[in-house]
Interface confidence: low
């Protein structure tokens, strides 16, 4: 019952973010990331440059709620995602058994007091196939369209070379030179693999939500904030900020 109330309240917060005073914080995210179909990925956000108290973090995909970590109630995973979504590490979210349908925008929504709501955006692309970097946990993504284009170009060039070889042998060197230059250019333009999940820049003031610390004072502070739902402090999640 409490989670039902919380879900209703959470949606309300998204639509009408709290805004009491200047919001100085920033959300750093893993940005645009890619992963292989069937694999796992960690989505991570990091709230920094504010001393605001984090009271709840929502993870959403487009307009679907994936998970909530609430300071009183701990983690809640939406029933429709419970088989594929797991909490952590940290305030992050692990998506497992990825499908192409998981491609899209993900949002971490930090509800803070007194600042209000901070939202971070991550774009996840789930690829049909990718080349695994030896020994790495996460796959190095390849841009499918780019690879396909490169194959088509190479094939076309090879065909042209084969057809013209008999007639104009001297032009072969020129075509191969062009191909080498084109390949080199393609490599330079090709984006490098994204940083590993969570490797955002650590800001000077970096509050993080921590679950599991039995800090009564933090939970007590939340009573006023959550009193509309008449929460009883369970001490499950203690979100507090660090400023140095």
């Amino acid at each position: 019952m409490r989670w039902c109330l919380l879900l209703i309240w959470a949606q309300g917060l998204r639509q009408a973010p709290l805004a009491s005073g200047m919001m100085t914080g920033t959300i750093e995210t893993t940005g645009n990331i890619s992963a292989e179909k069937g694999g796992s990925i960690i989505l991570q956000c990091h709230l920094s440059s504010t001393t605001a108290q984090v009271t709840q973090v929502n993870w959403e995909q487009q307009d679907q709620l994936l998970a909530i970590c609430n300071a009183d109630l701990g983690w809640h995973i939406s029933p429709s995602f419970k088989d594929r979504v797991a909490p952590g590490p940290g305030l992050g979210l692990t998506l497992q058994s990825l499908t192409v349908n998981d491609t899209g925008e993900y949002f971490c929504i930090y509800h803070t007091y007194p600042d209000g709501t901070y939202t971070g955006r991550i774009f996840l692309e789930v690829l049909e196939s990718s080349v695994a970097e030896h020994g790495a946990r996460f796959q190095i993504p390849l841009l499918g369209a780019m690879a396909a284009t490169l194959v088509v170009i190479c094939t076309a060039v090879i065909v042209v070379v084969a057809l013209t070889r008999k007639k104009k042998a001297l032009r072969i060197h020129s075509v191969e030179g062009d191909l080498r230059r084109k390949s080199a250019g393609q490599e330079e333009w090709s984006p490098s693999a994204p940083s590993p999940p969570g490797s955002c820049v650590q800001a000077e003031a970096a509050p993080a939500g921590l679950c599991g610390e039995q800090r009564g004072e933090d939970c007590a502070e939340l009573h006023d904030y959550f009193n509309v739902l008449s929460y009883r402090s369970l001490g499950n999640c203690s979100f507090f900020t660090e400023t140095g």
């Epitope: 419970k82 909490p87 952590g88 590490p89 940290g90 946990r137 679950c211 599991g212």
Partner: antibody, heavy 118, light 107 residues
Framework: QIQLQQSGPELVKSGASVKISCKAS????????INWVKQRPGQGLEWIGW????????NYNEKFKGKATYTVDKSSSTAYMLLSSLTSEDSAVYFC???????????WGQGTTLTVSS | DIQMNQSPSSLSASLGDTITITCHAS??????LSWYQQKPGNIPKLLIY???NLHTGVPSRFSGSGSGTGFTLTISSLQPEDIATYYC?????????FGGGTKLEIK
């Protein structure tokens, strides 16, 4: 207070299986991952993986896939780890530990000593 | 996998000394590093989380610092009860990994 109580020492034969339990109390069991950590005699700590009791989701260290299987019984707030096809390499102390949102293990079980005999 | 290289592997110091243990991650782990103390025959105990935050009940002579790939655990005014093995652990990505440990002895 928060406690993780593990089952007692086990002496099993090579090739057999063993199920280790970890009973949680003092907090909402379904809100935190239960991790399993291995420590061989005189050696360091090795993360095996975790299970999230709220959903049953699991995360395995690739090294232990096929060796360890995690389950939970929410009604008794107990997590279990089944270790199969045991060899002498599996002789170790196995800890359960709670993993919350802060990227750390804040509460640990007392450890279960597993001895695999040939 | 992220490798955690801890040094030194063993350390001998006198009571009252200040000692430093370092932990180097093979890739950027931001501040997602914890330190644990394990006394002989005992369970690991959390000392520091998020690189520099003291866990509840841990004496203030323990401190942690660092971010990115380099981290240190400092124990000032060494006490007899500090005899233990100390481990670092990264929480940046799976699999979660620990350092090899630093065994601290009193001279």
């Amino acid at each position: 207070q928060i406690q993780l109580q593990q089952s007692g020492p086990e002496l099993v034969k090579s090739g057999a299986s063993v199920k280790i339990s970890c009973k949680a109390s003092g907090y909402t069991f379904t809100a935190y991952c239960i991790n399993w950590v291995k420590q061989r005699p005189g050696q360091g700590l090795e993360w095996i993986g975790w299970i999230f009791p709220g959903s049953g989701s699991t995360n395995y260290n690739e090294k232990f896939k096929g060796k360890a299987t995690y389950t939970v019984d929410k009604s008794s707030s107990t997590a279990y780890m089944l270790l199969s096809s045991l060899t002498s390499e599996d002789s170790a102390v196995y800890f359960c530990a709670r993993y919350g949102l802060g990227h750390y293990f804040d509460y640990w079980g007392q450890g279960t000593t597993l001895t695999v005999s040939s | 996998d992220i490798q955690m290289n801890q040094s030194p592997s063993s350390l001998s110091a006198s009571l009252g000394d200040t000692i430093t243990i370092t932990c180097h991650a093979s890739q950027n782990i931001n501040v997602w590093l914890s330190w644990y103390q394990q006394k002989p025959g005992n369970i690991p105990k959390l000392l520091i989380y998020k690189a520099s935050n003291l866990h509840t009940g841990v004496p203030s002579r323990f401190s942690g610092s660092g971010s990115g790939t380099g981290f240190t655990l400092t124990i000032s005014s060494l006490q007899p009860e500090d005899i233990a093995t100390y481990y670092c652990q990264q929480g940046q990505s799976y699999p979660l990994t620990f350092g090899g440990g630093t065994k601290l002895e009193i001279k």
